[in-house]
């Protein structure tokens, strides 16, 4: 004959555990029913009566089968730099994530505790590493032959236009200006579109290598002529 199904509450066999969605109540020394997600234990079980469950109140939740006396409080409302990606219900906590243009500077178990605006690269610098949900933008100096004239968290260094006749040479923060005749092409040949590791606010020099010093990057330079020096400060 099949074993008789025990109904909660029941005393477990010595050495055995309670079944799925049951818990062992130390006081009653019985296996008792857990409450379903969205509920909590209003009255704990006894030897003769099972757990009495009740729905979570507004702004509280339980996400798992449980026997907690009170539901958990939902997190505070999302701040102005966040968007609510999961609402507070009886079965789940509110989840706040950072709005576009921001990243999570301090995360929590789910969602984000503190959002920060993505760094904007100033002119002469371009985005070398885009921001993600959890990391900031990294800006790098524009390479010779490239420029950025914006303050932006997305703009990379762009190649100078190539002129038949140059009216004003380009620099790291300004495109070349051609004379009235149109440029031969809009991009320097071989210029890399991604942000470059070399900048040109003035004539840039590679340091004399020492043990463990930053490597020379001459092989990374785009082809084409380097722009002349932009006047650096100094007396």
């Amino acid at each position: 004959l099949p074993a008789q199904v025990a109904f909660t509450p029941y005393a477990p066999e010595p050495g055995s555990t309670c079944r799925l969605r049951e818990y062992y109540d130390q006081t009653a020394q019985m296996c008792c029913s857990k409450c379903s997600p969205g509920q909590h234990a209003k009255v704990f079980c006894t030897k003769t009566s099972d757990t009495v469950c009740d729905s979570c109140e507004d702004s509280t939740y339980t996400q798992l089968w449980n026997w907690v006396p009170e539901c958990l409080s939902c997190g505070s409302r999302c701040s102005s730099d966040q968007v609510e990606t999961q609402a507070c219900t009886r079965e789940q906590n509110r989840i706040c994530t950072c709005r576009p243009g921001w990243y999570c500077a301090l995360s929590k178990q789910e969602g984000c505790r503190l959002c920060a605006p993505l760094r904007k690269c100033r002119p002469g610098f371009g985005v070398a590493r885009p921001g993600t949900e959890t990391s900031d933008v990294v800006c790098k100096p524009c390479a010779p032959g490239t420029f950025s004239n914006t303050t932006s968290s997305t703009d990379i260094c762009r190649p100078h236009q190539i002129c038949n006749v140059v009216a004003i040479p380009g620099n790291a923060s300004m495109d070349a200006v051609c004379t009235s005749t149109s440029p031969t092409r809009s991009m320097a040949p071989g210029a890399v579109h991604l942000p470059q590791p070399v900048s040109t606010r003035s004539q840039h020099t590679q340091p004399t290598p020492e043990p463990s010093t930053a490597p020379s990057t001459s092989f990374l330079l785009p082809m084409g002529p380097s722009p002349p020096a932009e006047g650096s400060t100094g007396d």
Epitope: R122, F125, C139, Q206, A214, T217
Partner: antibody, heavy 119, light 106 residues
Framework: QVQLVQSGAEVKKPGASVKVSCKAS????????IHWVRQAPGQGLEWMGW????????DYADKFKKRVTMTADTSISTAFMELSRLRSDDTAVYYC????????????WGQGTLVTVSS | DIQMTQSPSSLSASVGDRVTITCNGS??????LAWFQQKPGKAPKLLIY???SLQTGVPSRFSGSRSGTDFTLTISSLQPEDFATYFC????????FGGGTKLELK
């Protein structure tokens, strides 16, 4: 927290060279450029140049181009500024400062290194 | 090269006074102007960047403004700890500090 710690004071003779170090901690060293700024006794601040530690690329003020070399060692998160052919008017406190290339500029500075040039 | 002319070079004031320091750029520098405070024997400290933005942790009595190529640092009500030297700094086209303004107790 973010810290830039510079090497100790130096006394040099005219014509010699000096190398000042700036050790960074509390942030990703290669994500920021390092500026060097100096201040002669009782004078204002003078920008000397910057280095991008990631690749070692530099931008020097015209005044210092022939005499300054800025380097970085990413393995120890340290930037270096070497000034050669020292003169008495190079006597100054030399500072390093970090810059993330956003509108937020030089938000953390080293404590300064006094370099005295005297015969 | 862009020159930054800072005025006055020195200034005497009392606690509670409203103080303004001005920096004029020889060329357009957009909003790429910062203000630093320096106390004797200490490194400069960033107060304001991008003309108007207050650096984290800096008291709100400090503010920055602009009119054309004239940039102003205002301290609305001087506190004892504000007596120091102040420098403007342009970082739009190369890099250049103003000459400094020494703020002394009257």
């Amino acid at each position: 927290q973010v810290q830039l710690v510079q090497s100790g004071a130096e006394v040099k003779k005219p014509g010699a060279s000096v190398k000042v170090s700036c050790k960074a901690s509390g942030y990703t060293f290669t994500d920021y450029i390092i500026h060097w700024v100096r201040q002669a006794p009782g004078q204002g601040l003078e920008w000397m140049g910057w280095i991008d530690p990631d690749y070692g690329n530099t931008d020097y003020a015209d005044k210092f181009k022939k005499r300054v070399t800025m380097t970085a060692d990413t393995s120890i998160s340290t930037a270096f500024m070497e000034l050669s052919r020292l003169r008495s008017d190079d006597t100054a406190v030399y500072y390093c400062a970090r810059d993330d290339a956003s509108p937020l500029v030089m938000d953390a500075w080293g404590q300064g290194t006094l370099v005295t040039v005297s015969s | 090269d862009i020159q930054m002319t800072q005025s006055p070079s020195s200034l005497s004031a009392s606690v509670g006074d409203r103080v303004t320091i001005t920096c004029n750029g020889s060329q357009n520098i957009d909003n790429y102007l910062a203000w630093f405070q320096q106390k004797p024997g200490k490194a400069p400290k960033l107060l304001i960047y991008s003309t108007y933005s207050l650096q984290t942790g800096v008291p709100s009595r400090f503010s920055g403004s602009r009119s054309g190529t004239d940039f102003t640092l205002t301290i609305s009500s001087l506190q004892p700890e504000d007596f120091a030297t102040y420098f403007c700094f342009q970082y739009n086209n190369g890099y250049m500090f103003g000459g400094g303004t020494k703020l002394e107790l009257k």
